[in-house]
Interface confidence: low
């Protein structure tokens, strides 16, 4: 019986109308000839949010998204016709849905779209400096988008562009069946996962990709992909989905005789996010929806936040799980999953593991191999047949930090902000849902810093009509949250301290780490501020200790007003 299992009522529940009236949301309600504002790229330096949509790419001013520029990038009529002749929907499928938007260099972005079932990529010039105010498509230079963007707009691409090379997890064919993790662009030959081998990838849906250093040596850098896929036969009885984390060495150039132009360092592990059920059977949240990496002082060890939903149609639930990279690495250094034939169960591999251990990056840190092309044949053979790890990655504390079950919505997106408060640092989660609401949740330690309690601070409706939130970005510089959906883009501040009322007790009871009582109002808390009287208690939300008598009277109002 977990405290975080309680479907706690939000301290503030704001309708779209209330959000508008209190000037707490700015919305861009989309263009008549566009939709699907799903692909976000935040550029804090230029103070822009780039958004890929149907036939358009937008550049929004982070201060106010009402101020924007747009690029129109449709498909040719012939492409549209060809798509239509293939039996596709002219409005929902036969257009250029932007799926990849990445910073290419100091002056350009790289963008890819579905191109009406004929993926296409190009470069977008954004200039050197924000004041250049450049935002234009290089329409003289288009590239084949196969292996970069899916053909089908219903599918996602997880992409990452580093050092001029694009890593992408996507479907590489018209039918949306040949899913792979690719590395394209750059000077090297494109590399991909093994084709038509369900042990590697089994009908995956890619979520995101991240570069995480392994050591102080950049040669050891790895790219991690987060995705969900069908569980492989024998791994589970019946059809099931598993959430996965996959790893690839940045300096993987494929094999020499075998796995030529294929990854030699690809490994994957299952991500577990579950709660024990009353009957002793765990309830699994397997449908990974989104991932957010919270950077720590050590770039090698960000905290991974994952948003999951259940696969079951009968029991609808959502959860947030946290993972540590040290636990992930431990699993990748553990036993490989092995089976002797299609009808056998998966077991931990007990035999001799070849040297250097498959999944290790060729570098001076871990062994004397300069390139994956130099790896011994037995390493490559083993890597090809053992892409999966036997042990799963369990979340921190072996359980979700938040679950929601008896509600009419499911979680879809997450971003997290680390906030300095009077009594320590707190992670504030902003969780998007499939009904167009955003939950603002703070993790508060109970007895120990490991045992967290979730406080649902706010539930905000950010779009006029219920719509799935499909993209979210957080600007720490602007202290704003940006939200994307099929309908448009919304912007809201991370904090609305004044909305918590006019008394110290109300402010204190809110337990919002962004806010504190400054003696006369509930306002933004700055840890550097020298104000002597800053009443705030996130951990306990105890106004008796932190507020004067006058403020405490407001406590009853607060209680009465919100419950």
């Amino acid at each position: 019986n977990y405290a975080n299992g309680k479907n706690n009522v939000p301290r503030l529940k704001l309708s779209y109308k209330e959000m508008l009236e209190s000037n707490n949301v700015i919305t861009f309600n989309g263009l008549a000839n566009s939709s699907s504002y799903h692909t976000f790229l935040l550029d804090e330096e230029r103070s822009r949010l780039y958004v890929g949509a149907k036939d358009h790419i937008f550049s929004f001013n982070l201060v106010n998204i009402k101020d924007f520029q747009k690029i129109v990038w449709p498909v040719s009529y012939t492409r549209r016709d060809e798509c239509k002749w293939a039996g596709k929907d002219i409005l929902k499928e036969c257009a250029n849905f932007i799926k990849v938007l990445e910073a290419y260099n100091q002056t350009h972005l790289y963008a890819c779209g579905t191109g009406a079932f004929h993926p296409i990529c190009t470069y977008i010039e954004v200039g050197h400096h924000p004041e250049d105010n450049i935002f234009k498509l290089q329409d003289s230079h288009f590239e084949n988008g196969r292996g970069k963007s899916p053909y089908d707009p219903k599918l996602l691409t997880a992409s990452l562009l580093i050092d001029g090379e694009l890593y992408s997890g996507t479907a590489a064919d018209f039918m949306g069946r040949d899913f792979a993790i690719f590395r394209t662009l750059g000077h090297h030959h494109p590399i991909r996962t093994e084709q038509h081998d369900s042990r590697w990838l089994n009908d995956p849906r890619f979520i995101s990709a991240h570069l995480i250093p392994e050591s102080d040596n950049p040669e050891d850098d790895k790219v991690y992909f987060f995705f969900r896929e069908n569980a492989i036969d024998g791994e589970h009885s019946g059809k099931a989905t598993h959430a996965r984390i996959g790893q690839i060495c940045k300096n993987d150039f494929g094999g020499h005789r075998s796995l030529v132009n294929k990854w030699t360092t690809f490994l994957k592990a299952r991500l577990i996010c579950s709660v024990p059920g009353p009957n002793g059977i765990d309830t699994h949240f397997d449908e990974l929806q989104d991932v957010f990496l919270m950077n720590s002082k050590d770039p090698k060890n960000p905290i991974v936040y994952g948003v999951f939903t259940t696969s079951s149609n009968i029991f609808k639930g959502s959860a947030v799980c946290m993972y540590s990279m040290s636990d992930v690495r431990r699993v990748f250094l553990g036993p490989y999953a092995h089976r002797d034939g299609p009808n056998y169960q998966w077991v931990p591999y007990q035999g001799r593991v070849p040297y250097p251990r498959p999944g290790t990056c060729p570098s001076k840190t871990f062994g004397g191999f300069d390139s994956t092309k130099d790896l011994p044949d037995d390493v490559i053979t083993f890597a090809r047949s053992h892409p999966a790890m036997y042990n799963p990655v369990f979340p921190i504390n072996n359980r979700p930090i938040m679950i929601k079950t008896d509600v009419n919505y499911q979680f879809t997106q997450i971003v997290v902000d680390r906030v300095d408060a009077e009594d320590g640092q707190y992670d504030v989660m902003f969780i998007g849902t499939d009904v167009g609401t955003v939950l603002k949740v703070v993790s508060v330690p109970k007895e120990t810093w490991h045992d967290l309690e979730e406080i649902l601070l706010e539930e905000m409706t950010v779009f006029r009509e219920p719509t799935t939130i499909s993209a979210m970005e957080l600007s720490t510089k602007q202290q704003q949250l940006y939200i994307g959906s099929t309908a448009g883009v919304a912007q809201l501040p991370l904090h609305r301290c004044d909305i918590y009322g006019k008394a110290c007790a109300e402010c204190c009871l809110a337990r919002d780490p962004y806010c504190a009582w400054d003696g006369s109002s509930c306002s933004r808390y700055f840890p550097t501020a020298k104000a002597r009287t800053r009443a705030q208690d996130i951990r306990n939300g105890d106004p008796l200790t932190h507020c004067s008598d006058g403020g405490i009277e407001g406590r009853m109002d607060h209680h009465h007003h919100h419950h």
Partner: antibody, heavy 116, light 111 residues
Framework: EVQLLESGGGLVQTGGSLRLSCAAS????????MSWVRQAPGKGLEWVSW????????YYADSVKGRFTISRDNSKNTLYLQMNSLRAEDTAVYYC?????????WGQGTLVTVSS | QSVLTQPPSASGTPGQRVTISCSGS????????VSWYQQLPGTAPKLLIY???HRPSGVPDRFSGSKSGTSASLAISGLRSEDEADYYC???????????FGGGTKLTVLG
């Protein structure tokens, strides 16, 4: 290894019918669109018809529209071409080809001769 | 009359570089990927180049494809006797709603 094996060709009278089959192996047949391409003796290639992986859409060259019908049985990994109202100009080697944005694999072909 | 136009023949000596052209219109080559097929005497065609310039695995890098506007070309360097074959270009034609081929080019390796 991808293999496509055509059968069903032969000699037929003008106005007659034939049904060509193409047995596929070495790939997931149900994942791919398939096509028929023909080549008249001593002439070039001519695309005849193609069918979506799930039979959802079918397309024909103008020269065969209304006379030929393409179909597939994914459970049997087989592609078919039903040819009715055959004409002398339909005489050709008929190739079955796997479609993947282009014809990436071809069968060895089956000869159809239409005599008057 | 083929929708895509190719020279009926081409020739070269071993070791030479030969180029075969293929011209079309905006409804085929201009807006769609071009493929090249090789047909050795008495055999079925084989895919040589796809998506304008990409080689399937197993095709030697002596074969290369390129495209500019509504024309495409296939280049064969270091010509060998086993390259003697018919070569066809092909592309989807959006206005015809079908796949179109060139008339084919017979390549002869002299000497």
């Amino acid at each position: 290894e991808v293999q496509l094996l055509e059968s069903g060709g032969g000699l037929v009278q003008t106005g007659g019918s034939l049904r060509l089959s193409c047995a596929a192996s070495g790939f997931t047949f149900s994942d791919y669109a398939m096509s028929w391409v023909r080549q008249a003796p001593g002439k070039g290639l001519e695309w005849v018809s193609w069918i979506y992986y799930d039979s959802g859409s079918k397309y024909y060259a103008d020269s065969v529209k209304g006379r030929f019908t393409i179909s597939r049985d994914n459970s049997k990994n087989t592609l078919y071409l039903q040819m009715n109202s055959l004409r002398a100009e339909d005489t050709a080697v008929y190739y079955c080809a796997k479609l993947n944005g282009d014809f990436d694999y071809w069968g060895q072909g089956t000869l159809v001769t239409v005599s008057s | 009359q083929s929708v895509l136009t190719q020279p009926p023949s081409a020739s070269g000596t071993p070791g030479q570089r030969v180029t075969i052209s293929c011209s079309g219109s905006s409804s085929n080559i201009g807006n769609n990927d071009v493929s090249w097929y090789q047909q050795l005497p008495g055999t079925a065609p084989k895919l040589l180049i796809y998506a304008d310039s990409h080689r399937p695995s197993g095709v030697p890098d002596r074969f290369s494809g390129s495209k500019s506007g509504t024309s495409a070309s296939l280049a064969i360097s270091g010509l060998r006797s086993e390259d003697e074959a018919d070569y066809y270009c092909g592309a989807w034609d959006s206005s015809l709603s079908g796949y179109v081929f060139g008339g084919g080019t017979k390549l002869t390796v002299l000497g």
